[in-house]
Interface confidence: low
């Protein structure tokens, strides 16, 4: 139903606390450089305005669209051009062009210092002084670093953060209580951020159909007892919610998400028995619980897929009459039977099936043409299975650090034009997938691996789009969302790359490396490894092993020496010469 004042409607639905949090997130995600105090001032102004509209929906400006109100607020900031440069040019445009312009200026990699966690004592003092302000600061710091974070989920994590502090600041050993809790929140929030970023990229770069297909596959896996019509209804609402959040319409997104959770709880009998435990929780926890819900058990006696999608005489008729519905049904039926497959695999299978029908339904004997379609789709299943098995074996053999090194070599050979710090960052992220997924049972390994890889490659693609350096990376990132991972896997040594000239500085180390924390020490060594591959992209595995072994021995020797710096100065050039000889 239409409301006279959209902002009053959302204020009433969400309540003042969540309303203010969402306004703060909106501002922080768009104006990533502004100080916290400036945002707080704007949040209070917007909230006061919303309250005035609640009191009188006909009051001046209350009928304006929320996006327009936000745009007007941003464009009224006196220092806008000074702080944000060409973002200020957006203010010359009319909505909806102004909104699109603001979105294009969101920075996925803002030049901000890492979000360091203060000492527990300092955290608790600040929290006790003013916990609303403290939680506001958390929302601000996360939002400006993650400008596409799923806003209602961020409110949930802020609530978890608040609960952890409420509990632990009273504990005798604050650090022992807080550290594991905040580490867990941080890890889950980072995954949540990456998941939402992939959803937004899917919508923005590949369109609504791609996102809906992704959602059908995921929801069919989670709710295999629900009918296709029910899954479709949820997917339609979920698409609206996701589009709103990705578009920066966070008040609408959070409100509509609440509505979707309410709908799912009202219809839980026809969706999933697992919803019961979620539906008794309060608003934020309820929606989060549904998002993370354990999949329901498969219905018994499911007929063979071939009955409806190969043997049925009406296959081509059904395909021609309602292509998307027929393919959607195929994706639903396939996904609910295969909770162990990744979303990417399911979408590639559906795409393969579609391509087969496109070809066969135009032929004289369609059935003869598509009769063996499932056999022909088998390589789409075997390829990722084999890849996961090989990589997990390598991970088990080498451990996380060694596995990261192997990936650093592999990805440098695939895209040597990418900067060394970026290659190390992604090798480390890809390597951590081994830790996350390889210890899981066979049934979960495959989906865990490919679903995480999709998140990591999406981030790589987003940052590469900002500063493109490799045509092969651009090709893998833009041609097809579902084929990104197979595309990267298929890349081998870049034959067009001219090896980097040898620079001794890239392999020169000093005594300060000895006192670095283990993680930073690893990163330094991995930077040298990547530089080495850029210098000799076709070096054999044996040569690399020898060089890395010599390198480790050199570091150990010099870090154990009485006069460390003298050892580095004397033995460093010898090591460089030895490495060059090994790789010659």
């Amino acid at each position: 139903e239409a409301h006279k004042s959209e902002i009053a409607h959302r204020f009433n639905d969400l309540g003042e606390g969540h309303f203010k949090g969402l306004v703060l997130i909106t501002l922080s995600q768009h104006l990533q450089k502004s100080p916290f105090e400036e945002h707080v001032k704007l949040v209070n102004e917007v909230t006061d305005f919303a309250k005035a509209c609640v009191a009188d929906e006909s009051a001046q400006n209350c009928g304006k669209a929320i996006a327009t109100l936000f745009g007007d607020k941003v464009c009224a900031i006196p220092s806008l051009r000074e702080t944000y440069g060409e973002l200020a040019d957006c203010c010359a445009k009319e909505d909806p062009d102004r909104v699109e312009c603001f979105l294009q200026h969101k920075d996925d990699n803002p030049n901000l210092p890492p979000f360091e966690r203060p000492e527990p004592e300092a955290l608790c003092t600040a929290f006790k002084e003013n916990n609303d302000r403290f939680i506001g600061h958390y929302l601000y710091e996360v939002s400006r670093r993650h400008p596409y974070f799923y806003a209602p989920e961020l409110l949930y994590y802020a609530e978890k953060y608040k609960n952890a502090l409420t509990e632990c600041c009273e504990a005798a050993d604050k650090a022992a209580c807080l550290t594991p809790k905040l580490d867990a929140i941080k890890e889950k929030a980072l995954v949540s951020s990456a998941q939402q970023r992939l959803k937004c990229a899917s919508l923005q770069k590949f369109g609504e159909r791609a996102f809906k297909a992704w959602s059908v596959a995921r929801l069919s896996q989670k709710f295999p007892k629900a009918e296709f019509a029910e899954i479709s209804t949820i997917v339609t609402s979920l698409t609206k919610v996701t589009k709103e959040c990705c578009h920066g319409d966070l008040l609408e997104c959070a409100d509509d998400r609440q509505e979707l959770a309410k709908y799912m709880c009202e219809h839980q009998d026809s969706i999933s028995s697992k919803l019961k435990e979620c539906c008794v929780k309060p608003t934020l926890q309820k929606a989060h619980c549904i998002l993370e819900i354990q999949r329901d058990e498969l219905p018994t006696e499911l007929p063979d897929l071939a009955v409806d999608f190969v043997e049925d005489k009406e296959v081509c008729k059904n395909f021609a009459e309602a292509k998307d519905v027929f393919l959607g049904t195929f994706l639903y039926e396939y996904s609910r039977r295969h909770p162990e497959y990744s979303i990417g695999m399911l979408l590639r299978i559906a795409k393969g099936y579609e391509a087969k029908l496109e070809k066969c339904c135009a032929e004289a004997d369609p059935h003869a043409c598509y009769a063996k379609v499932f056999d022909e789709l088998q390589p789409l299943i075997d390829e990722p299975k084999k890849l996961v098995q090989q990589n997990c074996e390598l991970f088990d053999k080498l451990g996380e650090y060694g596995f990261q090194n192997a990936l650093a070599v592999r990805y440098t050979q695939k895209a040597p034009q990418v900067s060394t710090p970026t290659l190390v960052e992604y090798a480390r992220k890809l390597g951590s997938v081994g830790t996350k997924c390889c210890s899981l049972p066979e049934t979960e390994r495959l989906s865990c691996t490919e679903n995480y890889l999709a998140l990591i490659l999406n981030r790589l693609c987003i940052l590469h789009e900002k500063t493109p350096v490799s045509e092969r990376v651009t090709k893998c990132c833009t041609e097809s969302l579902v084929n990104r991972r197979p595309c990267f896997s298929a890349l081998h040594v870049d034959e067009t790359y001219v090896p980097k000239p040898f620079h001794a500085d890239s392999f020169t180390f000093h005594a300060d490396i000895c006192t670095l924390p283990e993680k930073e020490k690893q990163v330094k060594k991995q930077m040298a490894l990547v530089e080495l591959v850029k210098h000799k992209p076709k070096a054999s595995e044996e040569q690399m092993k020898t060089v890395m072994g010599d390198f480790a021995a050199f570091l150990k020797k010099c870090c154990d020496a009485d006069n460390k710096e003298a050892c580095f100065t004397e033995d460093g050039p010898k090591l460089v010469a030895k490495c060059q000889a090994t790789l010659a």
Epitope: A184, L440, P441, E444
Partner: nanobody
Framework: EVQLVESGGGVVQPGDSLRLSCAAS????????MGWFRQAPGKEREFVSA????????YYANSVKGRFTISRDNSKNTVYLQLNSLRPEDTALYYC?????????????????WGQGTLVTVSS
């Protein structure tokens, strides 16, 4: 619904050892991360140790590192906690917990199912 039943607690002297067991039923045991927590009288519940689904990863609180060992036998749906060199400050009710998340955590709110606990008393 997973049910967890702990056993093996008792009264021992400082320096002694104990082996706690936790038997699980009602779920696919090998898909759960298993953890041990403890709660001393009048204190908060605290994390002790956790083990991943295939026993590849184990994690310990600093206060028990080197003294306690966690292990699991997926064929028997059981997780164990070996307590060596026990100290009076180890006196507590020890709880077994199961988490269905794909990563293991030291945070109690990440665990979905809990046992009733088994009491360990270390006293001279």
């Amino acid at each position: 619904e997973v049910q967890l039943v702990e056993s093996g607690g008792g009264v021992v002297q400082p320096g002694d050892s104990l082996r706690l067991s936790c038997a699980a039923s009602g779920g696919t045991f090998s898909t759960y991360v298993m953890g041990w927590f403890r709660q001393a009288p009048g204190k908060e519940r605290e994390f002790v140790s956790a083990i991943s689904q295939n026993s590849i990863h184990t994690y310990y609180a600093n206060s028990v590192k080197g003294r306690f060992t966690i292990s699991r036998d997926n064929s028997k749906n059981t997780v164990y906690l070996q307590l060596n060199s026990l100290r009076p400050e180890d006196t507590a009710l020890y709880y077994c917990a199961a988490s269905r998340f794909t990563s293991w955590y030291t945070a109690d709110y990440e665990y979905d199912y809990w046992g009733q606990g088994t009491l360990v008393t270390v006293s001279s």
